[in-house]
């Protein structure tokens, strides 16, 4: 708690300006009026206050607004936002997209902090729905935010937002989320040529159906094993040996190292052994000649 001391003569702040960086903490507390601070918050971000001084300024705002800051103040918090706790932010009612952008800008380039997560949660709840503009903003700052949404929430993602997504941002997405995102990515990148299209769509292929994988196999895409291993098992199983060979290109030899892992293991079980032998990789476990292929649902029920 900062001492309550009288402001020295001649030091009462008439405006928020750079002279305040030379004030001691107790002088800031005594000489800066909280209402003046609130009306001139936009200046704070331009003045290189120390962290200790920012603590004093935050304390003054907390005293002025014990129920939570008004949006007019929140919009201009700047680096003072980094001093806020999730508990502070839960008191806010943020409705303006400009306010959200201003605060996300402060945290730009860093991982999503608990403060940012709380801010986004408050904003989305305040709006009542995750509209396209909000999602555009969030995916621009945090493309990985997509993977934190439910499939239902993802259904409102505009395809245009997909352009901001980087491969690593989908690392935490589960198959159900990729099922929703893949068609959107396909739509977003539909006007690109073959090789460029594959580079962009690659990260989303965990949601691709069999027919799309078959189509890709005709385009000499040379899919790497890491991508292949993330494909839906049910989408891979119907692919023929020839289609997988075309899909993987020179990477086909990597199947040997993955033969015990899904989806490769399950795919091998569905192929005729003599077809697998044509790959020359020594893959074992295919269907011997003369055997019938069981229906997929029957096979899963038996295993």
């Amino acid at each position: 708690e900062v001492e309550k001391t009288a402001c020295p003569s001649g030091k009462k702040a008439r405006e928020i300006d750079e002279s305040l960086i030379f004030y001691k903490k107790w002088e800031l507390e005594a000489c800066v009026d909280a209402a003046l601070l609130a009306t001139q918050m936009d200046r704070v971000n331009a003045i290189p206050f120390t962290y200790e001084q920012l603590d004093v300024l935050k304390h003054k705002l907390d005293e002025l607004y014990p129920q939570g800051y008004p949006e007019s103040v929140i919009q201009h918090l700047g680096y003072l936002f980094l001093k806020m706790s999730p508990e502070d932010i839960r008191k806010w009612n943020v409705t303006s997209l400009e306010t959200l952008k201003a605060l996300l800008e402060v945290n730009k380039g860093h991982e999503m902090s608990p403060q940012v997560a709380t801010l986004i949660d408050r904003f989305v709840k305040g709006r009542g729905q995750l509209d396209k503009d909000t999602l555009d903003t969030l995916t621009a700052f945090y493309p990985g935010y997509l993977c934190s949404l439910s499939p239902e929430e993802l259904s409102s993602v505009p395809p245009s937002s997909i352009w901001a997504v980087r491969p690593q941002d989908l690392d935490t997405c589960d198959p159900r989320q990729l099922d929703v995102l893949y068609p959107k990515a396909r739509l977003a990148f539909q006007n690109m040529n073959g090789s460029e299209y594959f580079v962009k769509i690659q990260s989303f292929l965990g949601g691709a159906p069999t027919e799309d994988l078959k189509a890709l196999s005709q385009q000499n895409v040379s899919m790497d094993l890491a991508t292949f291993m993330k494909l839906r098992t049910d989408a891979v199983l119907p692919l023929t040996v020839a289609e997988v060979q075309k899909l993987l290109g020179p990477h086909v030899e990597g199947l040997k190292a993955e033969e015990r892992h899904r989806p490769v293991r399950d795919w091998i079980l569905r192929q005729r052994q003599d077809d697998l032998d044509t790959l020359g990789l020594g893959l074992q476990g295919g269907i011997p000649n003369g055997y019938l292929v069981l229906d997929l649902s029957m096979q899963e029920a038996l295993s």
Epitope: G10, K11, E18, S19, F22, R43, A46, I47, P48
Partner: antibody, heavy 116, light 110 residues
């Protein structure tokens, strides 16, 4: 009304010394950092030195460090610049200015000429 | 060689809009506020913009400042003959422990 009035400029030989003064009025001098900025004839602005209200630390441009000394007397509302070992390239109009991060008030300047 | 980079000159006819850029680095503009100064011929500089975009009282709203990343710009809209002057940008640079100016831009009204 804020006023800054520089004095002490003049002609000096290379290696010589001069002391510039800046008398301030119209604001609480002891609350504000102060700076010196110079401008060589036909050239741009060059920051020279800055001093916070309590003189706790002093800041200098590399070109003058070790030769110039900034000081202030808050009781007299005056800023000083002691210039030693002057060189021809120190020839300029010297301005004093209020603040250190954005100079909101400037004096009219005093001309320092270093020549033999 | 100035730490902040400005174009040496800019010009426009009366009524036009002129923009002056100021490019720095993460250690000055990137982390500190930018100011702009106007110096009319034969006079001392005058503060035109402070804290990136604020105008002191008495400065017409034809002058506006902005900052993005490590660059800043000054825009003069509705150019007038009395705007013919040298314009300097400036910012504190903690890595140098000092203030840095741009080389100045001479604005000519054609």
């Amino acid at each position: 009304e804020v006023q800054l009035l520089e004095s002490g400029g003049g002609l000096v030989q290379p290696g010589g010394s001069l002391r510039l003064s800046c008398a301030a009025s119209g604001f609480t001098f002891s609350n504000y950092a102060m700076s010196w900025v110079r401008q060589a004839p036909g050239k741009g602005l060059e920051w020279v030195s800055g001093i916070p209200p309590d003189s706790a630390s002093k800041y200098y441009a590399d070109s003058v460090r070790g030769r110039f000394t900034v000081s202030r007397d808050n009781s007299k509302n005056t800023l000083y610049l002691q210039m030693n070992s002057l060189r021809a390239e120190d020839t300029a109009v010297y301005y004093c200015a209020k603040n250190m991060l954005s100079f909101d008030y400037w004096g009219q300047g005093t001309l320092v000429t270093v020549s033999s | 060689q100035s730490v902040l980079t400005q174009p040496p000159s800019a010009s426009g006819t009366p009524g036009q809009r002129v923009t002056i850029s100021c490019t720095g680095s993460s250690s000055n503009i990137g982390s500190n506020a930018v100011s702009w100064y106007q110096q009319l011929p034969g006079t001392a500089p005058k503060l035109l913009i402070y804290y990136n975009s604020k105008r002191p009282s008495g400065v017409p709203d034809r002058f506006s400042g902005s900052k993005s990343g490590t660059s800043a710009s000054l825009a003069i809209s509705g150019l007038r003959s009395e705007d013919e002057a040298d314009y300097y940008c400036g910012s504190w640079d903690p890595s140098l422990n000092g203030y840095v100016f741009g080389g100045g831009t001479k604005v000519t009204v054609l």
